[in-house]
Interface confidence: low
Amino acid sequence: MPGLGRRAQWLCWWWGLLCSCCGPPPLRPPLPAAAAAAAGGQLLGDGGSPGRTEQPPPSPQSSSGFLYRRLKTQEKREMQKEILSVLGLPHRPRPLHGLQQPQPPALRQQEEQQQQQQLPRGEPPPGRLKSAPLFMLDLYNALSADNDEDGASEGERQQSWPHEAASSSQRRQPPPGAAHPLNRKSLLAPGSGSGGASPLTSAQDSAFLNDADMVMSFVNLVEYDKEFSPRQRHHKEFKFNLSQIPEGEVVTAAEFRIYKDCVMGSFKNQTFLISIYQVLQEHQHRDSDLFLLDTRVVWASEEGWLEFDITATSNLWVVTPQHNMGLQLSVVTRDGVHVHPRAAGLVGRDGPYDKQPFMVAFFKVSEVHVRTTRSASSRRRQQSRNRSTQSQDVARVSSASDYNSSELKTACRKHELYVSFQDLGWQDWIIAPKGYAANYCDGECSFPLNAHMNATNHAIVQTLVHLMNPEYVPKPCCAPTKLNAISVLYFDDNSNVILKKYRNMVVRACGCH
């Protein structure tokens, strides 16, 4: 920033102005058949429905047009268990303040008017998001945008949730089968600048982004102001519960974020020094021992999100939760006078729900999560017994070609498979996406192996050997050759919001191995 020096870092905050109404966002192109069908109520599927097989022309790499049915309760439970296991979650989160089902606009408007009268200040109406989830949505969008730009086809993009915090007047009803964009008013922005520290180089930035496999936001647990001593009477206290961090996750960066409104009146030309302290030790009859973590200098007229680096203390809290006695914030004027944070425009827990203070932490796995395997084999045996007795039931997502009388199997390729979180009944805790195109590989790896089969040299040799000795050497297998990650944004049991990257969740390409 030429000629501005350090102070310029406090000048501009991103979303102070992003609170007036935005017009309806543009609609995304329609979902692929699979996603559209899944959005219409199917849990897992690839296109049409049992009565209606839609078959777009198959591309060399993927195919559509598959038969499927709704899963039974038991199967659904099994599916939920399996997916929770893949997501590394011991059980289905039941957040206190989760997301509620979106309602028809008229009913929603009527309910919102009633709720506005009943809700305590700072509590959003059901289905609306607080500051932390909204900020996390921006991160999620950033990641999704990156994924889009990295060449994922439309069918492989994650479909987002339709029910974010836009008012009903802002909504435009999409045609059936179209994905809803995340339509909400965004107030969120991290502060500009990085606390005076030299900004990370772009190489470090890229490495950091690639490394961070989980981002978690935490809500302030302090409900009532404590009586501090006269010297610290204007201090504000914040507490965040970091005890639920999955094992093996290490904090790479952590920030405390607080919103600052524009200050008018007697302080309108004032400059404030805002300091964040770690509480080291609490005492009964004297001030707590504090350790200064980060500071900001702000003008009264500034408006927007301020961020403070609390990486060091967060790591300590994760390793030794008993040391987590929270944070304290103090505000001092240019003349050295301690003032109440509200006088400096800082928004506390009694402020609007989308301006509540929160904490965000970036994590990196230090040890690989190993899925606990359950007895899949016994289940498979059970399924095959069921399949023989209930032949009318399509017990798996079956290719239309399976039903050809000629029994000719198509060549190895990617097939569409859409997993709908909505139909798993998870819309109250998974914020985004609504589901994702997992896809799968199926088909023959027969001689001669074509170029589009992405065959390895070994697979080619195996095919030749299979031709000569079919009873001893099997054909190569059709398996994923390219896998993509997905990002999932969800609430945990404590209503904290987590953004997690899951690698190898989407099949991008298949080949013979």
Partner: nanobody, 116 residues
């Protein structure tokens, strides 16, 4: 290192138009917001317009209805179309891109002078 390069500034008559553009030397990972700021001598830098990755836009009151912010996702470029320019719009205009993980990228600025 990533560089943001602004262009399109210059001298224009009051009531005229200009289109500023800001291109990144390479794609920045994890961008979730882009915006234009301006600064006049002796005054602090102020937000003019911003756009998020989900294409939400907003404008400072003093440019509403006259300026339009847009972005080209493919080329990682953000634009500011300025119509009905006034002498008080004279300033150095800076582009900023905010990336996930405590990083803001700023351009060097482009000067816009509106003569009466």
């Amino acid at each position: 290192e990533v560089q943001l390069v602004e262009s399109g500034g210059g001298l224009v008559q009051a009531g005229g138009s200009l289109k500023l553009s800001c291109a990144a030397s390479r794609r920045i990972s994890g961008i979730y917001a882009m915006g234009w700021y301006r600064q006049t001598p002796g005054k602090e830098r102020e937000l003019v317009a911003a756009i998020t990755t989900s294409d939400h836009t907003n404008y400072a009151d003093f440019v509403k209805g006259r300026f339009t912010i847009s972005r080209d996702k493919v080329n990682n470029t953000v634009y500011l179309e300025m119509n009905t320019l006034k002498p008080e719009d004279t300033a150095v205009y800076y582009c900023k891109q905010s990336a996930w993980g405590r990083n803001d990228y700023w351009g060097q600025g482009t000067r816009v002078t509106v003569s009466s």
